[in-house]
Amino acid sequence: EPPTACREKQYLINSQCCSLCQPGQKLVSDCTEFTETECLPCGESEFLDTWNRETHCHQHKYCDPNLGLRVQQKGTSETDTICTCEEGWHCTSEACESCVLHRSCSPGFGVKQIATGVSDTICEPCPVGFFSNVSSAFEKCHPWTSCETKDLVVQQAGTNKTDVVCGPQDRLR
């Protein structure tokens, strides 16, 4: 009785179960009653990452430097190349097909999380007691200067964009 279902890592063809090709290899010919499935290793710059019956291997991804990409992990016969972005840039998608410049946090905002090759800068508004007076992809919100610890007094209040201005205390005559 010909099978209607096959075991794991097999496929049904011409009423018989044939072995799938292992990752890193492509199908050359289906099995017969006399021979096993014939598979061949993928060529240079090609891969197949699953047990398969593909007749062609996939091309490794090209990390195009014109798009700000570079190789993070070189592909093998069983894995695709992984691209990431050049320093200062991050991927526009999970597939990392292109890059954009890291966002800078405007004055009044500080860096909550520094950008990586795959994620953009995360900014946060500087809370009371903190400020940022620069546009930066690295600077966090800085705490206002503590005038008291310097034996000074606040002459000008701080904002989310400016530090406090300290000055000498008025002397009693």
């Epitope: 009653e33 006399f34 021979t35 096993e36």
Partner: antibody
């Protein structure tokens, strides 16, 4: 009990033809692929031809392609090998074999073909 | 075509000894290899399939190993009836090919 019985061998002149038969019994013939394998006197084994269980697909090595034809009659439980343009190097014992689990799991007793003038 | 090379051509041993027969493929054939035994005047019979799978009715002293290009048939302790010729056969791709055989003879 699985049995494969070859017949049709004998002495034949170069250039002539011969048809070998293999009568199968003890199993469901139509469920199995079948092959012919030969062995020249004092030599090793050489695959000659294979045919799928339904008879739709046939396979040959290059050295016999075009000269040999494998066929089967599932209603008669019989396998055939038609050999044409015979040569001295075709002299051998011809075995009929059954394909089970992609192996030649049963063999007949063989029939001797001698090509000689 | 995949070429199978068996070695040695002849193995001279005494009953009770261990026999190790080699079969080397010209390219990787995974585990797609069978072993056959042929006694003088008899037809071959299947001993081992898929390189290491045992066949019912074949004594446990026969075992196979290997994968890729190098395969071994081992007879753990030779019995008088084991003196014969042994052939390997690949079924990885067409054409089906056999090794030239190893003769195990009594020393």
């Amino acid at each position: 009990e699985v049995q494969l019985v070859e017949s049709g061998g004998g002495v034949v002149q170069p250039g002539r033809s011969l048809r070998l038969s293999c009568a199968a019994s003890g199993f469901t013939f139509s469920n199995y692929g079948m092959s012919w394998v030969r062995q020249a006197p004092g030599k090793g084994l050489e695959w000659v031809a294979s045919i799928s269980s339904g008879g739709d697909d046939t396979y040959y090595p290059d050295n016999v392609k075009g000269r040999c034809t494998i066929s089967r009659d599932n209603s008669k439980n019989t396998l055939y090998l038609q050999m044409n343009s015979l040569r001295a190097e075709d002299t051998a014992v011809y075995y009929c074999t059954r394909a089970g689990g992609k192996a030649m799991d049963y063999w007949g007793q063989g029939t001797l073909v001698t090509v000689s003038s | 075509e995949i070429v199978l090379t068996q070695s040695p051509a002849t193995l001279s041993l005494s009953p009770g000894e261990r026999a190790t027969l080699s079969c080397r493929a010209s390219q990787s054939i995974r585990d797609n290899l069978h072993w056959y035994q042929q006694k003088p005047g008899q037809s071959p019979r299947l001993l081992i399939y898929y390189a290491s799978q045992s066949i019912s009715g074949i004594p446990a002293r026969f075992s196979g190993s290997g994968s890729g290009t190098d395969f071994t048939l081992t007879i753990s302790s030779l019995e008088p009836e084991d003196f014969a010729v042994y052939f390997c056969q690949q079924f990885n791709s067409w054409p089906l090919t056999f090794g030239q055989g190893t003769k195990v003879e009594i020393k």
